[in-house]
Amino acid sequence: ASVGLPSVSLDLPRLSIQKDILTIKANTTLQITCRGQRDLDWLWPNNQSGSEQRVEVTECSDGLFCKTLTIPKVIGNDTGAYKCFYRETDLASVIYVYVQDYRSPFIASVSDQHGVVYITENKNKTVVIPCLGSISNLNVSLCARYPEKRFVPDGNRISWDSKKGFTIPSYMISYAGMVFCEAKINDESYQSIMYIVVVVGYRIYDVVLSPSHGIELSVGEKLVLNCTARTELNVGIDFNWEYPSSKHQHKKLVNRDLKTQSGSEMKKFLSTLTIDGITRSDQGLYTCAASSGLMTKKNSTFVRVHEKPFVAFGSGMESLVEATVGERVRIPAKYLGYPPPEIKWYKNGIPLESNHTIKAGHVLTIMEVSERDTGNYTVILTNPISKEKQSHVVSLVVYVPPQIGEKSLISPVDSYQYGTTQTLTCTVYAIPPPHHIHWYWQLEEECANEPSHAVSVTNPYPCEEWRSVEDFQGGNKIEVNKNQFALIEGKNKTVSTLVIQAANVSALYKCEAVNKVGRGERVISFHVTRGPEITLQPDMQPTEQESVSLWCTADRSTFENLTWYKLGPQPLPIHVGELPTPVCKNLDTLWKLNATMFSNSTNDILIMELKNASLQDQGDYVCLAQDRKTKKRHCVVRQLTVLERVAPTITGNLENQTTSIGESIEVSCTASGNPPPQIMWFKDNETLVEDSGIVLKDGNRNLTIRRVRKEDEGLYTCQACSVLGCAKVEAFFIIEGAQEKTNLEHHHHHH
């Protein structure tokens, strides 16, 4: 056979044996002559081995550019391709020679010991075991062990070719440690050399360092870094590390394979770098590389080495945090330190513990901030090794958008008697206080809930044309008083009042308060009636279980058919500030009540009595009267609030105190509850009696002991009692100093 590309004038070298394949017997002589048109050379099988001494290449005696190859006493191993070629070209002629050696049908490899076949477990891959034959038509099978298995050519994916070897899908022999070819000749078995099976994987999925980041140590400590490589199966791994002092004498490297669950398609390798006494020069980037030969992956982490343990606050640590009620507040403790400090938070000196509303850790988190969270928060960092402490104060200011106190109490409509002077009030609580409170108004008929007006939750008022109260043309004459500031329920509030000098026109009034974090508004329905008048007997809000009467008084000559109703649930829920349907136009929402009629010379009085009032009795009560002439109905509405019974509680500054003889003691004991409790004082469990030295004021709320004496020392108890029980607080008063014995001194006694 000829190979190579023909050049312009050169013919291929010509062999004396004009065949592609030559079969000869062992121990005979092989001789082939090659002739050509320029310098020739021969290549033969195994021509890099020691068998070269047996091969003779000689110049022909009968001409130029001719060489004869001679091998006396050929053996099976001489089987292979013999190539004659022109020097420095690809022009060559080849003959494949089989040396039939029935005692050695397989050509031995150069090493003659064993071969290696590399395979992957890929289902689609085939592997060739290079057991070449010295005879072309052998019956060859492949033996794999252990366990022993034999594979026979199947005319498909398993085959044997004398020039190539045994081809088989690689996964079939991936279990085996070794394979060899076997040929049967006249019932004799002949084996090739052994081939060791090496299953190769190469893929590294990832390389992970642990700890992966934020590694900090101080001089002298031990650094332990783990590097884990996850790979496919049948992979070998080389690890290498790169780090600042690679020449470290205290360094230790341990590499090992990690056990993985059987059936896992993954293998894990671990390399551990240990530096026993770390120094400042060891600070820097540590990189671990894992390599299988075909794939390398690496990962890095920074190791920071401190001279000694320390703790300090970071520059970003805030001193003032501002928030609005309801927000989530996060105050991070920004620190520098090694090791990480213990962090403790305090509010106004009291330790904070985590619960469902507050998380006190590296970050102080207040889930939904409220006013009571305002204050000074101290964070104390403690270095766990050196016990060094650092503290920092953060002031939390919680802003409150304007809240209008009356808003929560507002009834749908209260009625106002025609011609009367009325005061409308908006009590605003806001932090910071509102920078303005403005009043607006609108005529009632311009803003009635007609069916044509769509009332929605987002826009509860169908009226949009609010006018400033300065422009009261067509309405009631108005005067806005200067805002006042009042301490109400312990809170500083801004009170804005609007005085309607004569209630002539039904209107709506709106107060609007604005501060830096929001706005609040209240709409007041100012319904003016010439109709009946409602009064409350007694004229105060009743408490549960008390009795109250609602009186409806109407001029007998003008009105008839007085009836009491209670306003039931509205067809639409009443949103704060939303205007209800005018009561008289919608009797469906009214429940008729039983009442008693009385008369005097000019008026009819319809009395509706509530004995034993309960919280369920709260609501809007409507007195309806009919005009005798026009038959037009007139309604008056009164909101009734029933106060809940509350057991006594005490607030105030009753605390243990030490006083010198002759000084005064002033303490207060503020009690709340409904009905209001009675306050009593005791000294050493005996009732405290007022005398010239002991003064009780403001319903016993305030106790003053003038010119105290030694005998005034003792346990003082303030007790607040009502029908619902008692509450008490105690304090011990210590009196210091020597008693001066003087006749002029006033003595007071109490038992």
Epitope: V200, R203, G236, N240, G293, L294, K298
Partner: antibody, heavy 117, light 112 residues
Framework: EVQLVESGGDLVKPGGSLKLSCAAS????????MSWVRQTPDKRLEWVAS????????YYADSVEGRFTISRENAKNTLFLQMNSLKSEDTALYYC??????????WGHGTTLTVSS | DVMITQDELSNPVTFGESVSISCRSS???????????LNWFLQRPGQSPQLLIY???TRASGVSDRFSGSGSGTDFTLEISRVKAEDVGIYYC?????????FGSGTKLEIK
Amino acid sequence: EVQLVESGGDLVKPGGSLKLSCAASGFTFSMYGMSWVRQTPDKRLEWVASISIGGSYTYYADSVEGRFTISRENAKNTLFLQMNSLKSEDTALYYCAREMDGNYDYWGHGTTLTVSS
Amino acid sequence: DVMITQDELSNPVTFGESVSISCRSSKSLLYKDGKTYLNWFLQRPGQSPQLLIYLMSTRASGVSDRFSGSGSGTDFTLEISRVKAEDVGIYYCQQLVEYPFTFGSGTKLEIK
């Protein structure tokens, strides 16, 4: 700057041997897998051999298995390719390449091997 | 071994235009980790190959965003937008899904 400089290419007779070297600089040699890739006269690229960072694991193309040996000397930042029983089909421009994540991210300029009698 | 096929020449392109170079694999290069192990190299005249794209579509460090890779499991495309003179050379694709890693025969970028 990463640099890979190959050397050792020559004209060799078929059956002969040759050793190629690749000097690396500008990076930590011992942290990268290294490979040899050759480019035949018809401009085809063929992967030849690869070696792991410590030199424990080597891989070869079937065409050179048993004839070529890849090795490295990390202390000298040098990669080697020992080539025996050379054939005319080994004639090529031999590149050494740096490998990370299986990718050859830097290549040398190559050294030429010609196998011819 | 996995065979990688490439056209010898690209469609002729004028500077400033876009061009697509294709590459086909005899087997899917989508590995079980969900990544597609196909790389693109450019060999400029007289230079050594340079990695452009790895994992089918990730640009190598310092490579212009004019180069983008896409494809399915077996069919891949390298797109070069606004072609410049420096883009001239042979483009090779290479598979890394199965050992031995094999290269395509290369596609020469042809300029009109």
